[in-house]
Amino acid sequence: SGVFQLQLQEFINERGVLASGRPCEPGCRTFFRVCLKHFQAVVSPGPCTFGTVSTPVLGTNSFAVRDDSSGGGRNPLQLPFNFTWPGTFSLIIEAWHAPGDDLRPEALPPDALISKIAIQGSLAVGQNWLLDEQTSTLTRLRYSYRVICSDNYYGDNCSRLCKKRNDHFGHYVCQPDGNLSCLPGWTGEYCQQPICLSGCHEQNGYCSKPAECLCRPGWQGRLCNECIPHNGCRHGTCSTPWQCTCDEGWGGLFCDQDLNYCTHHSPCKNGATCSNSGQRSYTCTCRPGYTGVDCELELSECDSNPCRNGGSCKDQEDGYHCLCPPGYYGLHCEHSTLSCADSPCFNGGSCRERNQGANYACECPPNFTGSNCEKKVDRCTSNPCANGGQCLNRGPSRMCRCRPGFTGTYCELHVSDCARNPCAHGGTCHDLENGLMCTCPAGFSGRRCEVRTSIDACASSPCFNRATCYTDLSTDTFVCNCPYGFVGSRCEFPVGLPPSFPW
């Protein structure tokens, strides 16, 4: 689509005569008829296939034609066409005398023609005017002409339609050749694709407007390049959404089970060595002079009862000292000056002479020991309590105070963690060496199956055409990440030719 423009500049008819040679009375009131048609080697009468246009009376005899309008007419004259410009044309320009005001062809006498010119040739689309002058024996016409494209049409033949737009269907202006030139922030064949925030992750982020970065489910951060771990993940990280990969020293589905109690809590006191022995379980190896589960108790050197034969022990800064009873001597009161005659055996012990009465030995009743049966038997010396239990002397017997999770006379039995039915919503309980584990039925999760979760929205494979499915745990819905060439909430529609635009 375009316009053939003809600009009349000057008409000379010095004698004011018609083509027949007859003069006009009082002068030749001149108007023009223009016929534009397809190329003809010899221009002949017939339909003006490209269009016609007439002017009002522009002057008398000889005159110059002003630009733009003159007496209501337009200059240049416009001959629009709605087809591809062929590059060639034929042009007929007739000058007529108008005796009255009626300029219709049928209202004029046939001899009112002043002059007629016909040209033909090739003409390319362009902004430049071609100047021409045609002379006959009595008249001269100077004019120029050109072909330009209509608004929104471009190219060598005005055949390329391009209408600038900035809406859902595209964001572009048109280049001189009719190609699209995308507005800043847009790309793609029809400039419909926004250019996301610089660095926005190609798979995990997207945008609906330029310079933004919207994250797909399971991703976050300014560039949508940080995954969101599984809800409930305590001491873990992820490399893909909803994962929970445990940090060093942590275990369990949510990385909330402490496998390195020693490092995280430092329970052993007084320089003791700590050893991990399972979830929240540890053993302290005490330095000399300390005791207790956490080596929190300081031992007295007299606690080992080093003084024999009823000697009394006194703690000193650099050790201990034994005060011996009469008849005994030595560092630990181990030497005797007594015999059976002195009744040296305590607590009902019976005395036996040795070395012809120079020495003796005491035979002690149960629960007593020592060379003079002066000591009660300490039933805890053999460390009979297992699993870190604490041994307590209780009169003639002993007992073990067990740590949490253990029972039995010697704390040798592991308490069944499943005995109290800890798994909710019908979960199955499994006893482990260091705790328990719940296997949850569908629709529940958490350490104890206490969290009601939705069934995985992606389980039914709702996405088509090899699209990636993401479950959005916050809304119980799925989102399909379409591969190139597919669109739709399930990626079900192939991207065909762009929709035809309603120009």
Partner: nanobody, 123 residues
Framework: EVQLVESGGGLVQPGGSLRLSCAAS????????MSWVRQAPGKGPEWVSA????????YYADSVKGRFTISRDNAKNTLFLQMNSLKPEDTAVYYC????????????????WGQGTQVTVSS
């Protein structure tokens, strides 16, 4: 169920200070980026500040840079906004929100919002 409950708003004189808190529940707070958004009467929401999940990276709108400080306590599931040198133009309802997308200057889409707390700066 995700819940965000803001508190700490009130009436304060120009130049004064306020500390806003946002208590989060129903999700693993320490795994999510968080932000503060405000809405003045008759205006649209305006992003104020944001902080990444670990708390090591913070972002501020130009209008509050140097005056406001965002922080978080993941152990207590709480987000904070310390507001100093307050101006009358800071008057708005302040919301804490989980950002879902970012623009060139800051967050621009949000997955969840709290109910908001009113801050009024006036003499």
């Amino acid at each position: 169920e995700v819940q965000l409950v803001e508190s700490g708003g009130g009436l304060v004189q120009p130049g004064g200070s306020l500390r806003l808190s946002c208590a989060a529940s129903g999700f693993t707070f320490g795994s999510y980026d968080m932000s503060w958004v405000r809405q003045a009467p008759g205006k649209g929401p305006e992003w104020v500040s944001a902080i990444n999940s670990g708390g090591g990276t913070t972002y501020y709108a130009d209008s509050v840079k140097g005056r406001f400080t965002i922080s978080r306590d993941n152990a207590k599931n709480t987000l904070f906004l310390q507001m100093n040198s307050l101006k009358p133009e800071d008057t708005a309802v302040y919301y804490c929100a989980i950002p879902r997308g970012w623009g060139p200057t800051g967050p621009l889409e949000y997955g969840y919002w709290g109910q908001g707390t009113q801050v009024t700066v006036s003499s």
